[in-house]
């Protein structure tokens, strides 16, 4: 246990994480993170699961948010926009979507590169998950900084 | 000592910051930043040193945040996207990026405005500050309320 | 009074906030929110008034967002850049602008998309009221996700 | 590639003062970290004080940080220290170390020899008693 699940006492501990973009080869439009860099993680009332979903166990108000920095162009991506989606999955229940954001692609060339920010206060449930979506995966830039997710307990 | 001080207690007093961007003639990437209009400087757990960077006292996590409106024009500027960068110094330690954002230019005349927003959760150490760094400093706007940066522990 | 009310106590309650866009046809600049969806009211310290403004009992501080997608085109639009700001209104004095991001219109067709994110840390008095204002409310997206506003008291 | 360049080294007389210089060139030194280090005869190189790429902020060993004061002018691409009060221990060549700024090594510490990318030949102090 850390430091920083003491310092509210053990009925409150402070519960907060701060994940790292990480490409992937997979063929899913849902973005992989990692704790590697710059991360958090303030204890185990916070997972990443499966490199994907951020998991609490706790219920509570969560202030949520992730950033994602993308590089597209107009000609070679679909007419449809660049897309992010802060996601919920909460035991028993369907996914269903929080917080998104919509960037028409840029005409720039090759691709110019656009940041994208989401965030807001929900409550979670014991055991509920966090991901987020993307359009086009292939378009995220993954250099140091530019794309993020995490969450703090209120 | 203000009120923020005492609402927790001694022991664990509210600690936040905003401050609002200040044009400067310095040749210099570093936004500068000054305590004016609606700001917040809790108390003197935080500080806003040299105009550019907020500086804590104590260890611990903390939500920091940066709001950066600029304004550029593609055949102005220099083929790089506009990017804003998050930066910590922590005593001892070197300078290191924790969030970054890209913007390619815009194409409207004589400038396109665009906005960036960074936020994210970091622990940082007593001593440790926090600065904005942007590509081009002399496009970014300075109205009320356009770009802004700060903190708030945990 | 709701399980966020007692989980710091009576004394100092967890306040927090999230609503989510309504269309609306009245032809004013203020966008209009609801209780509705995915949505966060803590308890009755926070309130949605008319459906515009979030407005909080207690004094103190608060880190305060919203996020604003909108479709728009260069041709179809003023030449000035779409502005969402962040407003406050306090008892016994002027309606102010805390926060202001801007986006110059897309050159897509019929519009382009994009989002605006705002957060910052004010202080609110007893009675106060947040609000969002933008340039031209009828280009605002109110799909599920794209435009929310909220607050939570530190 | 940057070069380094140290000049200003010499004798001088225990309490006397001299101010060492570093002259960088290639890509602009602005994204750098800077950093004096300095070698004793027979012992290992030791860090003296860091200076950071875009705040400026320093860092100094706790022994010397009473009489040494280190700075960077950006427009001239060099370092500077400023070296007060010297002492017989002093004696030493002084070393000029730089790092990118976008560097990720091993080592994230400024007074450690191995985060460093480039460094110059040295210049040498001696100080008489």
């Known amino acids: 246990e850390n430091s920083f699940e003491m310092q509210k006492g053990d009925q409150n501990p402070q519960i907060a994480a701060h994940v790292i973009s990480e490409a992937s080869s997979k063929t899913t439009s849902v973005l992989q993170w990692a704790e590697k860099g710059y991360y958090t993680m303030s204890n185990n009332l916070v997972t990443l699961e499966n490199g994907k979903q951020l998991t609490v166990k706790r219920q509570g108000l969560y202030y949520i948010y992730a950033q994602v920095t993308f590089c597209s162009n107009r000609e070679a991506s679909s007419q449809a926009p660049f897309i992010a989606s802060l996601c919920l999955k909460s035991p028993g229940r369907f996914e269903r979507i929080l917080l998104r954001a919509a960037n028409t692609h840029s005409s720039a060339k090759p691709c110019g590169q656009q940041s994208i920010h989401l965030g807001g206060v929900f409550e979670l449930q014991p055991g509920a998950s966090v991901f987020v979506n993307v359009t086009d995966p292939s378009q995220v830039s993954h250099g140091t900084g530019f794309t993020s997710f995490g969450l703090l307990k209120l | 000592e203000n009120s923020f001080e005492m609402q927790k207690g001694d022991q664990n007093p509210q600690i936040a910051a905003h401050v609002i961007s200040e044009a400067s003639s310095k040749t210099t990437s570093v936004l500068q930043w000054a305590e004016k209009g609606y700001y917040t400087m809790s108390n003197n757990l935080v500080t806003l040193e040299n105009g550019k960077q907020l500086t804590v006292k104590r260890q611990g996590l903390y939500y920091i945040y940066a709001q950066v409106t600029f304004c550029s024009n593609r055949e102005a500027s220099s083929q790089a996207p506009f990017i804003a960068s998050l930066c910590l110094k922590s005593p001892g330690r070197f300078e290191r990026i924790l969030l970054r954002a890209a913007n390619t230019h815009s194409s409207a005349k004589p400038c396109g405005q665009q906005s960036i927003h960074l936020g994210g959760v970091f622990e940082l150490q007593p001593g440790a500050s926090v600065f904005v760094n942007v590509t081009d400093p002399s496009q970014v706007s300075h109205g009320t309320g356009f770009t802004s940066f700060g903190l708030l522990k945990l | 009074e709701n399980s966020f009310e007692m989980q710091k106590g009576d004394q100092n309650p967890q306040i927090a906030a999230h609503v989510i866009s309504e269309a609306s046809s009245k032809t004013t600049s203020v966008l209009q929110w609801a209780e509705k969806g995915y949505y966060t009211m803590s308890n009755n310290l926070v309130t949605l008034e008319n459906g515009k403004q979030l407005t909080v009992k207690r004094q103190g501080l608060y880190y305060i967002y919203a996020q604003v997608t909108f479709c728009s085109n260069r041709e179809a639009s003023s030449q000035a850049p779409f502005i969402a700001s962040l407003c406050l209104k306090s008892p016994g004095r002027f309606e102010r602008i805390l926060l202001r991001a801007a986006n110059t219109h897309s050159s897509a067709k019929p519009c382009g998309q994009q989002s605006i994110h705002l957060g910052g840390v004010f202080e609110l008095q007893p009675g106060a009221s947040v609000f969002v204002n933008v340039t031209d409310p009828s280009q605002v997206s109110h799909g599920t996700g794209f435009t929310s506003f909220g607050l939570l008291k530190l | 590639e940057v070069q380094l360049v140290e000049s200003g080294g010499g004798l001088v007389q225990a309490g006397g003062s001299l101010r060492l210089s570093c002259a960088a060139s290639g890509r602009t030194p602005l994204n750098y970290h800077m950093a004096w280090f300095r070698q004793a005869p027979g012992k290992e190189r030791e860090f003296v004080a860091a200076i950071s790429s875009l705040l400026g902020s320093t860092d100094y060993s706790d022994s010397l940080k009473d009489r040494f004061t280190i700075s960077r002018d950006n427009a001239k691409a060099t370092l500077y220290l400023r070296m007060n009060n010297l002492k017989p221990e002093d004696t030493a060549v002084y070393y000029c170390?730089?790092?990118?700024?976008?560097?990720?090594?091993?080592?994230?510490?400024?007074?450690?020899?191995?985060?460093?990318?480039?460094w110059g030949q040295g210049t040498l102090v001696t100080v008489s008693s």
């Open positions: 170390a730089a790092r990118e700024t976008t560097h990720y090594s091993t080592s994230d510490r400024v007074n450690e020899m191995r985060a460093y990318d480039y």
